[in-house]
Each structure stands twice: as structure tokens, then as C-alpha cells.
Amino acid sequence: QGWQAFKNDATEIIPELGEYPEPPPELENNKTMNRAENGGRPPHHPFETKDVSEYSCRELHFTRYVTDGPCRSAKPVTELVCSGQCGPARLLPNAIGRGKWWRPSGPDFRCIPDRYRAQRVQLLCPGGEAPRARKVRLVASCKCKRLTRFHNQSELKDFGTEAARPQKGRKPRPRARSAKANQAELENAY
């Protein structure tokens, strides 16, 4: 199926506070992961801050005509193309409990389609041929999803489903920590 670009603009997906749910407590290895409510120093941003736009998962809006052989849609359709980076975690505060930010390398995320929508289009054909009706599947929204070793690169795992495994080489310490980990960044960029 051919596509002809008509125009495009961009929308940045910057997650709101609380957009991602907290993991169940048992996934945190019986530890409180330095959240602000556990006391300690007031939160601040220890990590190097970059321009948010450099890391946003963007929805590029493309207006195109749908073509099928010699036939073309009577009206253009608007579709999203997912583009840009995912992170940093300062935009995803509720994910921090799962993140082991002190590691030099961590989960890799991609900006990919999240939801789709079906749209019926009417195709006009040359030579007096009767118009055809076609249903097309269009990207409706984008999301940061984690690459996972249990899937192919094309099949991605939702950001909110990452579970922390117990780590080797350390014992659970169920006591309050400083607020600093709340400010961690997952600077995963592509």
C-alpha cells in the first residue's frame, strides 16, 4: 500500500506525575527505595539535567493519502509516527523504585506505537471504476516501552511492568533511606 506524505507536525509525549504505577512492594526486595516520604534530605536533582525535548517520545502527525494501486483516498488521513528518545526518569518519578540507577547501564527503552485506531476510507479509482471502501489501521498514540530479552526487538514490554529481581551480593535492608533516589534518571536515548 502506498502512502503520500501531505503535511506533518509533532507532539511530545512527556509523562505526567503518577502516570506509571508503583510496583508491588514485594518486587522491591523488601527495601524502601529511598522515597521522599521515608525522610532524609529534601529531594533535589543530583543528576546532570538535559533539555527535556532531547529526551521526549514524540508523536509526529503525518497527513497522507491512502493509495491502493491506481486508487487514492478521497480525503487524506492523519497518522502518527513515533519518534525521539525515552527518558530521563525525572519525568517518570514512580518508576524509580524499580530502577537501579547506580548501575552504569540499564534498561533500554524505545518510543513505539501504543494504541491504534481503525479508520474507514473511500478510495477513488480512475477510469470510471466504482469507489472502494477500505479500513486502515493507524497509529493513535506512542509510548516508551522497554526492550526485553524475552521478546524479539519488535515486541516490546511496557515500561510499567518492569519488575526488580533480588540482586546478588547484597542483603535486604528494610529501613528508611534518603530521598535522593527519587531524583534518578534513566538517560536512555536512541
Epitope: K31, E48, P88, R103, K180, A189
Partner: antibody, heavy 119, light 110 residues
Framework: EVQLVESGGGLVQPGRSLRLSCAAS????????LHWVRQAPGKGLEWVSG????????DYADSVKGRFTISRDNAKNSLYLQMNSLRVEDTALYYC????????????WGQGTTVTVSS | QSVLTQPPSASGTPGQRVTISCSGS????????VNWYQQLPGTAPKLLIY???QRPSGVPDRFSGSKSGTSASLAISGLQSEDEADYYC???????????FGGGTKLTVL
């Protein structure tokens, strides 16, 4: 100027202990996660251990687990590596390194201290 | 034997573009971000690329990183004599639960 300076290296017999230190300056120490990375003579880099803001955030390489202990003293701007039951294969240049960008690589390095384990 | 596989050596002439590969598996590069380090002779390593393709401030844009599947690459364009060094890739390995380095690639500028 951001600086990490390692000390405590030396010649030690197999089975003995050694404690490495890393003194930091030029940055807010407890904003950084800190790591030990070693390099055997003529060989590549090998990550040894890492610690976050406190002892609740620690990782070790399998090769040193149970023998080495990483710790930090934020009041003294210092990182430590207690090395017990040393083996000949632990002979290496030990680097102290840090990262203050979550999952963003080790962006600060010391010049290293040499540990030689030999009988 | 390193968990991440790099060619032991690479070479190029000044001005040329050179690429260094790093091959891993689904438990390291396939899942986690890749970092690259440069170690000039007799000096400590230096972070060159983090999070697959991001350059820390001060690193020239001649250096670029990319990742696809379980492999990563470091590209150096406009090769200069001062680029002669050892280059290491690294990533967290979820199976080993540790930070793993490639064996290193010695880059020679002819």
C-alpha cells in the same frame, strides 16, 4: 576540578587482605554512584563492584563476591574496597570510577592503584 | 573470554571513517543500554558514548554510537592520530547481574 585519587595498593601474598581507598574532590560526592574497575597487566577492563548512595545499593562481580566488600563514607568523600582472601588473579590496576547520570556510564575515573598478589 | 565480543584490532588512515563492533546477547546489549570507553596509552579510561548513542560534553561529534538487536557499533569519522587508543564497549548483563566489558579493540591510525 573533578578528581578521584586511589590509594592502598601494594604487594601482598595470596590469602592476605588489602584495603583500597578512593578520595574524591571537585564534585558533590554523594551525588555519585561509585565503582571499582580493574585491569590486569596487558588485559582489558573488568568491573569489580559498584555502590549507590548507601549500602542498600550494592553490586559485585561474581569473581569477587564473598571476598571483596565495597563501602563509602560520604562524610569523608571516600570510597573503599576491602579485599580479603586475595588470589594471584586479582593482580591488576584498580580504578575508582563514578557516574552521576542514571544508567549513563562511568564518566569520572581515577588514575588507578596497583595491586600485586604474589608469593 | 569476554561476554561482549569486539575485534582485537582495527586500523585506518587519517580522515577515514572506522567502525568498531561489539556483539553481545539478549541478556546484555539486547536489553540494556551500551556505553563506550576510550583508553589512551598509559591513561585511565574515558567515557566516550553512553546510553547507546549519547556523547558526554567534550566528546567530539566525530564519535557516534548505535545499537541494533544484540550488537552495538562505535563509529569514528575523520580519524585523527590522537584517536589511537583501546576502545571498550560495556553493558549491564541481566543474567550475570554485573557490568560487562568487551575485550577491547586496539585502534591504530596508519
Amino acid at each position: 576540578e573533578v578528581q578521584l585519587v586511589e590509594s592502598g595498593g601494594g604487594l601482598v601474598q595470596p590469602g592476605r587482605s588489602l584495603r583500597l581507598s578512593c578520595a574524591a574532590s571537585g564534585f558533590t560526592f554523594d551525588d555519585y554512584a561509585l565503582h571499582w574497575v580493574r585491569q590486569a597487566p596487558g588485559k582489558g577492563l573488568e568491573w569489580v563492584s559498584g555502590i549507590g548512595w548507601d549500602d542498600d545499593m550494592i553490586d559485585y562481580a561474581d569473581s569477587v563476591k564473598g571476598r571483596f566488600t565495597i563501602s563509602r563514607d560520604n562524610a569523608k568523600n571516600s570510597l573503599y574496597l576491602q579485599m580479603n582472601s586475595l588470589r594471584v588473579e586479582d593482580t591488576a590496576l584498580y580504578y575508582c570510577a563514578g557516574n552521576n547520570r542514571g544508567y549513563g556510564g562511568l564518566d569520572v575515573w581515577g588514575q588507578g592503584t596497583t595491586v600485586t598478589v604474589s608469593s | 573470554q569476554s561476554v561482549l565480543t569486539q575485534p582485537p584490532s582495527a586500523s585506518g588512515t587519517p580522515g577515514q571513517r572506522v567502525t568498531i563492533s561489539c556483539s553481545g546477547s539478549s541478556s546484555n546489549i539486547g536489553t540494556n543500554t551500551v556505553n563506550w570507553y576510550q583508553q589512551l596509552p598509559g591513561t585511565a579510561p574515558k567515557l566516550l558514548i553512553y546510553s547507546n548513542n549519547q556523547r558526554p560534553s567534550g566528546v567530539p561529534d566525530r564519535f557516534s554510537g548505535s545499537k541494533s538487536g544484540t550488537s552495538a557499533s562505535l563509529a569514528i569519522s575523520g580519524l585523527q592520530s590522537e584517536d589511537e587508543a583501546d576502545y571498550y564497549c560495556a553493558a549491564w548483563d541481566d543474567r550475570l547481574d554485573e557490568y560487562v566489558f568487551g575485550g577491547g579493540t586496539k585502534l591504530t591510525v596508519l
